[in-house]
């Protein structure tokens, strides 16, 4: 038997992926474990094999179909179980009734690009990936800019409280290298959380024009 505290957390990307992490103190690394998804109103079941990500946690992705296919709705409930092999039998280690649209975490924004850059400002755009059409415009974004000599953790967060897939960064320093990241979150869902940060976009502001001698 496996003793210790267990945590089983899953998020739906709003389209065709449920990502799960299972943590178990005292669990055996070489045990074969599966996440099993059993929807209450669908004709399919889905499993994924949990793979170790640290000493006491495992993760896997339940891929429900093509990336942009809408596989679940707001009324679906999916029973999720962690099952681990014990000899010739499988033991249920964790179980939850999962409401997909209460547990959302979208994919990181993609296709970041500099639309226009000047000496003190830069206009950047991006796209959301694999986000359900159900959200319509009910999304918000956070962005951050990495300045020279600072860390990402020190970067102030800029909040966009609407579905706005661009930003104009201002009060930048001329001829300076910056990096930019953005993340997205639906307004819906009690346990919904921010997407991962996007891949950083590097850009450089234009040099200031040479002033005339006085």
């Amino acid at each position: 038997a496996v003793n210790g505290t267990s945590q089983f957390t899953c998020f739906y990307n709003s389209r065709a992926n449920i990502s799960c992490v299972w943590s178990q103190d005292g669990a055996l690394q070489d045990t074969s474990c599966q996440v099993h998804a059993w929807p209450d109103r669908r004709r399919w079941n889905q499993t994924c094999e949990l793979l170790p990500v640290s000493q006491a946690s495992w993760a896997c992705n339940l891929i429900l179909g093509a990336p942009d296919s809408q596989k679940l709705t707001t009324v679906d409930i999916v029973t999720l179980r962690v099952l681990c092999r014990e000899g010739v039998r499988w033991r249920v280690m964790a179980i939850q009734d999962f409401k997909p649209f209460e547990n959302l975490r979208l994919m990181a924004p993609i296709s970041l690009q500099v639309v226009h850059v000047e000496t003190h400002r830069c206009n950047i755009s991006w796209e959301i990936s694999q986000a359900s059409h159900y959200f319509e415009r009910h999304l918000e974004f956070e962005a951050r800019t990495l300045s020279p000599g600072h860390t990402w953790e020190e970067a102030p967060l800029l909040t966009l409280k609407q579905k706005q897939e661009w930003i104009c960064l201002e009060t930048l320093t001329p001829d300076t290298q910056y990096e930019f990241q953005v993340r997205v979150k639906p307004l819906q869902g009690e346990f919904t959380t921010w997407s991962p940060w996007s891949q950083p976009l590097a850009f450089r502001t234009k040099p200031a024009a040479l002033g005339k001698d006085t």
């Epitope: 074969s32 599966q34 099993h36 399919w44 079941n45 889905q46 499993t47 994924c48 094999e49 793979l51 896997c60 891929i63 429900l64 179909g65 093509a66 990336p67 099952l83 499988w90």
Partner: nanobody
Framework: EVQLVESGGGLVQAGGSLRLSCVVS????????MAWFRQAPGKGREFVAV????????EYVDSVKGRFTVSRDNAKNTVYLQMNNLKPEDTAVYYC????????????????WGQGTQVTVSS
Amino acid sequence: EVQLVESGGGLVQAGGSLRLSCVVSGDVFVRYTMAWFRQAPGKGREFVAVVTDSGRTTEYVDSVKGRFTVSRDNAKNTVYLQMNNLKPEDTAVYYCAANTDYFQIRSVDNNAWGQGTQVTVSS
């Protein structure tokens, strides 16, 4: 709808080797637990081997353990069955099977199937 196409069967002498391949199309391959079954003349379809979606875990029927190896290449949408030290009793039509549910794949009812490839082992 998912489609499966096997290849690699043939006639081989006892003690020889064959490598079967099964190419999957029509859906996202990594959704599927994959398995090989076989059906000898006049017998039912028998489970041979299974590989999980990640490819990390494999299982075999006792009669092929140590001789057969199942594997998958998720980049090529292909599952393989390497068969070594073949015996006359391995003669059968070999079928590739796919199921999104690891726990259902051994019960043949809900699997997607290939058309099969004939393996004949002569003594």
